[in-house]
């Protein structure tokens, strides 16, 4: 592989590494969405909640804005966190006054784990390709990274649908919502992993024939 190609591959892998870190952060943190109910009349607080793939945290938040709205409050201070019942059946999460969309939550978590799996396998391939000059391993690595990105965006969409259903459901008190930084991390990770995977595939392909009399066999040999 030429010097310029190697440089391009390394830059691409750096962006993929950043995407992988963002994906990991998104999966393990609880700030995918923030939900808040109507402002209670007897006290100017919101029982706001933020949740991720595995658990939900609630916190009472004082409302200081002029219109006394619960919208766009940020849960902070003392929090109560609990893993979703289907991930920890022994734990009671009554205090959270929350109906989870079980199927959505399980699906989003499972798909996100697949994404991390693809990132790990892709990284192994990329590492081996550098270690022993097996450049051909960059191709499966790029595919794994692209698949990881796709899994992540599917997980994001499943979570989006979950939030929509929770807000629309008559069986929850949540009336307002916005997507938070874990969600942004997942979206950024998708972009970096998917595009990084595609670029890596492009850079790792053998040079295409540039003249009519050349064949693929004439392309520079791979180590």
């Amino acid at each position: 592989m030429s010097q310029t190609k190697t440089a391009k591959v390394r830059v691409t892998l750096f962006f993929i590494l950043v995407g992988g870190v963002l994906a990991m952060v998104a999966v393990v943190t609880d700030h995918w969405a923030v939900l808040s109910p109507h402002l209670e009349h007897h006290n100017e607080t919101c029982e706001a909640a933020h949740f991720g793939l595995w658990r939900i945290c609630t916190a009472r938040v004082a409302v200081h804005n002029k219109d006394k709205s619960c919208e766009h409050v940020t849960p902070s201070g003392e929090k109560n966190c609990s893993y979703f019942r289907h991930f920890n059946p022994g734990e009671s999460s009554e205090i959270f006054e929350f109906t989870t969309q079980k199927e959505y939550s399980i699906s989003a978590a499972a798909i996100a784990i697949f994404s991390l799996g693809f990132i790990i396998v892709g990284s192994i391939c990329a590492f081996l390709s550098f270690g022993n000059k097996r450049d051909y391993l960059l191709r499966p690595a790029s595919m794994f990274y692209a698949f990881a990105g796709l899994c992540l965006i599917v997980s994001v969409e499943v979570m989006r649908q979950s939030v929509k259903r929770m807000i629309d459901s008559e069986d929850t008190v949540w009336i307002e919502h916005y997507y938070s930084w874990s969600f942004a991390c997942a979206c950024a990770a998708f972009i970096l992993l998917f595009l990084g995977g595609l670029f890596l595939l492009l850079f790792s392909l053998p040079r295409m024939p540039q003249n009519p009399w050349e064949s693929c066999m004439d392309a520079e040999p791979e180590h």
Partner: antibody, heavy 116, light 108 residues
């Protein structure tokens, strides 16, 4: 399919306490919010308040000082108590599943008349 | 609290005609959180529409909701004999939840 049935006295004397119970069948009372509403004769509906199966409740500010909603998960029931009733509290009282949004599942309603 | 005013109080129409019921709020309803119910005498209300325009489960497509802000409309495209009942709107954009006084749709 969840079904709700209100029960309680149809006649209450002024200044006394109105007590109603809603029995839930076809589903567990757990994991859901439960609401009381009422409709005075010839008028619109009025939201009284809701309770969660864990016991936390929220009430309409106009009735808050007189109303208590409680839940008994072992009997799959929740109850309404309205103190110091007057003729203005004469209404059809409904229980429903839900809290602070719309209501898909309702009881048939029970008429409570406040009269001496 | 948000006051909901329904008009007209009574609507006299014939089967097969189009009914347009109005619900006006005293202030803007957040996220168009408005529901419509049908109520038969001696029966509990039946949810027709939520979120201003989403039809509830098993509700015929002749019922449709529209509107935003403070003005909302329930339209029944072709009145069937069983549609001649009282219709109420309810807002859930802010507490306390409030209901309109109702519109009675009667046979002309």
């Amino acid at each position: 399919q969840v079904q709700l049935q209100e029960s309680g006295p149809g006649l209450v004397k002024p200044s006394e306490t109105l007590s109603l119970t809603c029995t839930v069948s076809g589903d567990s009372i757990n994991n859901y919010y439960w609401t009381w509403l009422r409709q005075p004769p010839g008028k619109g509906l009025e939201w009284i308040g809701y309770i969660y199966y864990s016991g936390s409740a929220n009430y309409n500010p106009s009735l808050k000082s007189r109303v208590t909603i409680s839940v008994d998960t072992s009997k799959n029931q929740f109850s309404l108590k309205l103190n110091s009733v007057t003729a203005a509290d004469t209404a059809v009282y409904y229980c429903a599943r839900g809290a602070v949004k719309y209501f898909r599942h309702w009881g048939q309603g029970t008429l409570v008349t406040v009269s001496s | 609290e948000i006051v909901l005013t329904q008009s007209p109080g009574t609507l006299s129409l014939s089967p097969g005609e189009r009914a347009t019921l109005s619900c006006r709020a005293s202030q803007t309803i957040n996220h168009n959180n408005l529901a419509w119910y049908q109520q038969r005498p001696g029966q509990a209300p039946r949810l027709l529409i939520y979120g201003a325009s989403n039809r509830a489960t098993a509700i015929p497509d002749r019922f449709s909701g529209s509107g935003s802000g403070t003005d909302f409309t329930l339209t029944i495209s072709r009145l069937e004999p069983e549609d001649f009942e009282v219709y109420s709107c309810q807002q859930y954009g802010s507490l306390p939840l409030t209901f309109g006084g109702g519109t009675k749709v009667e046979i002309k």
